[in-house]
Interface confidence: low
């Protein structure tokens, strides 16, 4: 059910409180690895290691994306992979910066209709199902860079060209400036900066904090919408329970979002989506007579 839909592998790099930011190179334990007279030491992090077959996956996704999207056919996927790899290979996985990803950002530059952007927080699956049906709207993961990295984990090791498949830094327990977190922070910021007119955001009404200031949306995207371009942020609050007819647009966290947005000189609007299953069905078939009653 909707209660189980979380942001999964789009790692919520900022989800903890700020005291986690003091973590640096010293965290992680050293463990012996390999055989031979000179033991090789590797840092042991708290998070899962790089996704299996990471290089092949990124390359394959890039090829597939550029085949499906004619406007990106000019992209050289080998160069994309080299730039991706260059952002984190041989670098300490707790010392990654947005600058490390700039060559990749440059290669992945893509124009999406700025008035067709759908942001989401902790309800990724439904957001993606929606843009699969409503093909002229885009989530971050519908862009090349978002598509490449969606659901993947990666990190390297300082001073070696190896990819670490054993473990990678966890945002909370190890450090915030890790390769995955910095990547999503960078692309999320750029995506929000590109938005114009009316920007939509899908929020999970089943969560205790429907709007969470510590989510990617709450800490990066909200603050990077450009008031001179964005007229309105419209929140779609997705209900989880079939019989839940409360107006979740009145939730205190939504009021908090409205306050933040209003202070940035952007208008705020909110809609409840009571029946996400019916909502998707009605996006597919708006002519269906049952789609004129509540969704």
């Amino acid at each position: 059910g909707l209660n189980d839909i979380f942001e999964a592998q789009k790692i919520e790099w900022h989800e903890g409180s700020h005291h986690h930011h003091h973590h640096h190179h010293g965290s992680g334990s050293l463990v012996p690895r390999g055989s031979g007279s000179v033991p090789r030491w590797r840092q042991q992090w708290s998070g899962p290691g790089t996704t299996k077959r990471f290089p092949e996956t990124v390359l394959a996704r890039c090829v597939k994306y550029t085949e499906i999207h004619p406007e990106m056919r000019h992209v050289d996927c080998q160069s994309v992979w080299d730039a991706f790899k260059g952002a984190f290979i041989s670098k300490h996985p707790c010392n990654i910066t947005e600058e490390d990803y700039q060559p990749l950002m440059k290669l992945g530059t893509q124009t999406v209709p700025c008035n067709k952007i759908l942001l989401w927080s902790r309800i990724k699956d439904l957001a993606h199902q929606f843009t699969q049906v409503q093909r002229d709207m885009f989530t971050l993961e519908d862009t090349l860079l978002g598509y490449l990295a969606d659901d993947l984990t990666w990190c390297g090791e300082f001073n070696t060209s190896k990819i670490n498949y054993q473990s990678c830094p966890d945002w909370r327990k190890d450090c915030s400036n890790n390769p995955v977190s910095v990547f999503w922070k960078t692309v999320s910021r750029r995506f929000a900066e590109a938005a114009c007119d009316v920007v939509h955001v899908m929020l999970n009404g089943s969560r205790s904090k429907i709007f969470d200031k510590n989510s990617t949306f709450g800490s990066v995207e909200v603050h990077n919408l450009q008031p001179e371009k964005v007229q309105t942020l419209e929140a779609w609050v997705i209900h989880g329970g079939r019989e839940d007819s409360r107006d979740l647009c009145q939730d205190p966290t939504i009021k908090e979002l409205e306050s933040i947005i209003s202070k940035r000189n952007i208008q705020f609007s909110c809609k409840n989506i009571y029946r996400p299953d019916k909502f998707l069905q009605c996006v597919k078939n708006p002519e269906d007579s049952s789609c004129t009653s509540e969704i």
């Epitope: 008035n115 409503q134 002229d136 709207m137 009316v198 939509h200 309105t232 419209e234 779609w236 019989e243 007819s245 107006d247 647009c249 208008q267 609007s269 909110c270 809609k271 409840n272 989506i273 009571y274 909502f279 009605c282 996006v283 708006p286 002519e287 007579s289 049952s290 789609c291 004129t292 009653s293 509540e294 969704i295």
Partner: antibody, heavy 123, light 112 residues
Framework: QVQLVQSGAEVKKPGSSVKVSCKAS????????ISWVRQAPGQGLEWMGG????????NYAQKFQGRVTITADESTSTAYMELSSLRSEDTAVYYC????????????????WGQGTLVTVSS | DVVMTQSPLSLPVTPGEPASISCRSS???????????LEWYVQKPGQSPQLLIF???NRASGVPDRFSGSGSGTDFTLKINRVEAEDVGVYYC?????????FGGGTKVEIK
């Protein structure tokens, strides 16, 4: 404050078409349903159909199916209603109306109305 | 289509007195979420219609509290507890449960 401003009165010949516009200002356009409702002289209100711009596909009352086309241009926040094969019975004031709902993502809850456009069909 | 029947057709009222308009639908407007998808509109002379009541009994913003909506399923009532001169106009009920949306024939409220 949401405002809906409609195009001016039209006089048309039977068999021709008319296209009425409805420009929205002062609020979100794309995900709020815009409906078209008409009122013949001295008669009641009649819903013709509507569109949720973000979804693009219109929903029409069976009575007008095939004769009416409702579209929306998100770039100008304008909705259009085109009625073809006009006959004298189509003489009416045509209103656009927008939902103002945090309650349902749908037609109805017409909090905002245009000023109306009189279309006269006469030979 | 859902047929909406209003009565009376005309309602002469005295200012300060209550008034009541009835609306009946050919099928239930009660949705599975517990709400009745019935709305009331008034069209004052020379004006566009305006929303009074939505979801059967909820007053729209800016609507005076002398207006109230009640009923469920197929039978609904709009009450004005003390009519004022500015309340003259034609009152319509409308079902918003399914396509096509349909209006009642209207009730003309006029001052005696």
């Amino acid at each position: 404050q949401v405002q809906l401003v409609q195009s001016g009165a039209e006089v048309k010949k039977p068999g021709s078409s008319v296209k009425v516009s409805c420009k929205a200002s002062g609020g979100t356009f794309s995900s709020y349903a815009i409906s078209w409702v008409r009122q013949a002289p001295g008669q009641g209100l009649e819903w013709m159909g509507g569109i949720i711009p973000i979804f693009g596909t219109a929903n029409y009352a069976q009575k007008f199916q095939g004769r009416v086309t409702i579209t929306a241009d998100e770039s100008t926040s304008t909705a259009y209603m085109e009625l073809s094969s006009l006959r004298s019975e189509d003489t009416a004031v045509y209103y656009c109306a927008r939902d103002s709902s945090s309650w349902y993502f749908t037609y109805g809850y017409f909090q905002h109305w245009g000023q109306g456009t009189l279309v006269t069909v006469s030979s | 289509d859902v047929v909406m029947t209003q009565s009376p057709l005309s309602l002469p009222v005295t200012p300060g007195e209550p008034a009541s308009i009835s609306c009946r639908s050919s099928q239930s407007l009660l949705n599975s979420n517990g709400y009745n998808y019935l709305e009331w509109y008034v069209q004052k002379p020379g004006q566009s219609p305006q929303l009074l009541i939505f979801l059967g009994s909820n007053r729209a913003s800016g609507v005076p509290d002398r207006f109230s909506g009640s009923g469920s399923g197929t039978d609904f009532t709009l009450k004005i507890n003390r009519v004022e001169a500015e309340d003259v106009g034609v009152y319509y009920c409308m079902q918003a449960l399914q396509s096509p949306l349909t209006f009642g024939g209207g009730t003309k409220v006029e001052i005696k």
